[in-house]
């Protein structure tokens, strides 16, 4: 058992049939010595008396808010949560495995630039009695500060018969240099509590590996005289790190015809303009990636060819 | 082909081309090493990220773009011990900081060159002959060093008489290649920035 925060305790249980569970001793936070009784949650049933209460925690029915009373007045509370370990592996029932970029990916994080600001998100099908808290640092043995904001419900989606909820959090490294060469990874720890179940999820990454630029902006087409070619131009996204000559992007450009079967012509360029040929009903798209470190490509920015 | 992009003319800044080759070689060599050593801890998540140039050079700080010099988080350890001139420099316009920066890059390359050569000598004694560095990566390091054209005493290759631990040597190679790739990214950014300036 360990303290998650004041008056909230996590009991770690090996979860298998007929498991012995954990013996837990609760102590009433009071100078009183006599006439103390204990109850669990809203039930008025007295579980024991005395300054301490010893219980065997085996299942969720044994978890909850234990309260010690004297003369009808509550003296202190202890909330017990369960953290299940099955076959030596901590449970991951609350969050959905996003399977990207690999299996057992529960937290996904992205950064739009090298400023030390990043966003992490996770998915769940649970809609009620759910709370999250997030901590982050650079490195674990001698951690350097990262400040995270409040967790927000960022999206709701219908997936077949289920509703899926996306939660996200924004974090900022306290003293980040965009040009720095990262040697220690950022660690992100998410505590998830659903009713009386506690789970924790972690992710470890370098900012350079989670970079995903915003799409190029101000995409423009200029037709060339007596030709079905157009001069296309675009600009670096506003959110990308500066100076652009140091934090350079490379671009992938494509012309996509009206039918998905039609072959896509793709080329790569470091410039912010190109000459393309527009087919009927085609659209022109461009995406960006860090020129020197192959992290994610941005989403496509698109414009109709004509 | 339905798309066309004009190819750029020759770069004004002669080191840019060499730094691009350096990054390509660093990335390709690392990728190849990860494939060959797939059963060794050789991924970014598995290795310790060491920096053999730590406390010896200050490339990131010395080569900071002017726009980031105001950022206090970037100025933890300003090193100002190097000053000299080289053929990549645009002669009179060369600033003190630019000379310092290029000198620091040169020193990085020299250190990695020694480490890679020492490691290669060990790996060539491995009876499995599982992995060793091809001449490409050593060649591009050499080309960029020549383009930087700093006079520097040659560092002797470290020799070792005892039989190497090949497992440890291969892990060390992974660590070295990861670190070198990160430094090659910084070098390429710097050269691109200087070329644009």
């Amino acid at each position: 058992i360990w303290e998650l925060k004041k008056d909230v305790y996590v009991v770690e249980l090996d979860w298998y049939p007929d498991a012995p569970g954990e013996m837990v001793v609760l102590t009433c936070d009071t100078p009183e010595e006599d006439g103390i009784t204990w109850t669990l949650d809203q039930s008025g049933e007295v579980l024991g008396s005395g300054k301490t209460l010893t219980i065997q925690v085996k299942e969720f029915g044994d978890a909850g808010q234990y309260t010690c009373h004297k003369g009808g007045e509550a003296l202190s509370h202890s909330l017990l949560l369960l953290h299940k370990k099955e076959d030596g592996i901590w449970s991951t029932d609350v969050l959905k495995d996003q399977k990207e970029p690999k299996n057992k990916t529960f937290l996904r994080c992205e950064a739009k630039n090298y400023s030390g600001r990043f966003t992490c998100w996770w998915l769940t099908t649970i809609s009620t009695d759910l709370t999250f808290s997030v901590k982050s640092s650079r490195g674990s043995s001698n951690p350097q500060g990262v400040t995270c904001g409040a967790v927000t419900l960022s999206a709701e989606r219908v997936r077949g018969d289920n509703k899926e909820y996306e939660y996200s959090v924004e974090c900022q490294e306290d003293s980040a240099c965009p040009a720095a060469e990262e040697r220690l990874p950022i660690e992100v720890m998410v505590d998830a509590i659903h009713k009386l179940k506690y789970e924790n999820y972690t992710s470890s990454f370098f900012i350079r590996d989670i970079i995903k630029p915003d799409p190029p902006k101000n995409l423009q087409l200029k037709p060339l005289k007596n030709s079905r070619q157009v001069e296309v131009s675009w600009e670096y996204p506003d959110t990308w790190s500066t100076p652009h000559s140091y934090f350079s992007l490379t671009f992938c450009i494509q012309v996509q015809g009206k039918s998905k079967r039609e072959k896509k012509d793709r080329i790569f360029t470091d410039k912010t303009s190109a000459t393309v040929i527009c087919r009927k009903n085609a659209s022109f798209s461009v995406q960006a990636q860090d020129r020197y470190y192959s992290s994610s490509w941005s989403e496509w920015a698109s414009v109709p060819c004509s | 082909r339905n798309l066309s992009v004009a190819t750029p003319g020759p770069e004004m800044f002669p080191c840019l081309h060499h730094s691009q080759n350096l990054l390509k070689a660093a990335s390709n060599t690392l990728q190849k090493a990860r494939q060959i050593l797939e059963f060794y801890p050789c991924t970014s998540e598995e290795i310790d990220h060491e920096d053999i140039t730590k406390d010896k050079t200050s490339t990131v700080e010395a080569c900071l773009p002017l726009e980031l010099i105001k950022n206090e988080s970037c100025l933890n350890s300003r090193e100002t011990s190097f000053i000299t001139n080289g053929s990549c420099l645009a002669s009179r316009k060369t600033s003190f900081m630019m000379a310092l920066c290029l000198r620091s890059i040169y020193e990085d390359l020299k250190m990695y060159q020694v480490e890679f050569k020492t490691m290669n000598a060990k790996l060539l004694r491995d009876p499995k002959r599982q992995i060793f560095l091809d001449q490409n990566i050593l060649g591009v390091i050499d080309e960029l060093m020549q383009a930087l054209n700093f006079n520097s005493e040659t560092v002797p290759q470290k020799s070792s008489l005892e039989e190497p631990d090949f497992y440890k040597t291969k892990i060390k190679l992974c660590i070295l290649l990861h670190a070198f790739r990160i430094r090659a990214v910084t070098i390429d950014r710097v050269m691109s920035y200087l070329n644009a300036s």
Partner: antibody, heavy 119, light 110 residues
């Protein structure tokens, strides 16, 4: 920039025939080429086209009856099994624009070659 | 697609104005992929107007084109004897296979 059709002659029904359009002064890799025909005393009929990248398109009535192909300086129109209704002057015409859409303006035109199908 | 040209034939006097209409059974691509041609006996057609209203180079300014979508017009103002010919419209569509010429309008100058 010139175009010239050749291969027009008298053929019996069912005898395959290939007409050739030879171009000069421009590149077929940047221009779309069209075949158009005109029966005696009648109007113009678009048969089909081959685009700069080698893609082909045919009028609905012409599909399966005609095949268009090209080399670096020639464009061929193959008539698989001519009938008397295919008697006409056959023109090749270039797309007016570089990388023209199919259906874009046609300019210049060749002088035409006459095909007579008769038994 | 079917392109219907009216009227045919049309008679014109020198110095007068001739208007030829071209109606498409479906909207041409981007509302303007329509061109006009002039053909004289024994000659190949000659491009006059492209993109519905743009005059091809070397074509006298007395020729003009207008219209959009499915209705288009070729106008010859100040008709000259040399304008006696057959005029065709050509439409391009979303589906390349629908590309087609109109039936032609013969202009007789008296």
């Amino acid at each position: 920039q010139s175009l010239e059709e050749s291969g027009g002659r008298l053929v019996t029904p069912g005898t395959p025939l290939t007409l050739t359009c030879t171009v000069s002064g421009f590149s077929l890799s940047t221009y779309t080429m069209n075949w158009v025909r005109q029966s005696p005393g009648k109007g113009l009929e678009w048969i089909g086209a081959i685009s700069y990248d080698g893609g082909t398109a045919y009028a609905n009535w012409a599909k399966g009856r005609f095949t268009i192909s090209k080399t670096s300086t020639t464009v061929d129109l193959q008539i698989a099994s001519p009938t008397t209704e295919d008697t006409a002057t056959y023109f090749c015409a270039r797309g007016f624009y570089v990388y023209a859409y199919i259906g874009d303006a046609f300019d210049p035109w060749g002088p035409g070659t006459l095909v007579t199908v008769s038994s | 697609a079917v392109l219907t040209q009216t009227p045919s034939p049309v008679s014109a006097t020198v110095g007068g104005t001739v208007t030829i209409k071209c109606q498409s059974s479906q909207t041409v691509y981007k509302n303007n992929l329509l061109s006009w041609y002039q053909q004289k006996p024994g000659q190949p057609p000659k491009l006059l107007i492209y993109l519905a209203s743009t005059l091809a180079s070397g074509v006298p300014s007395r020729f003009s084109g207008s219209g959009s979508g499915t209705q288009f017009t070729l106008t010859i103002s100040g008709v000259q004897c040399d304008d006696a010919a057959t005029y065709y419209c050509l439409g391009g569509y979303d589906d390349d296979a629908d590309t087609a010429f109109g039936g032609g309008t013969e202009v007789v100058v008296v």
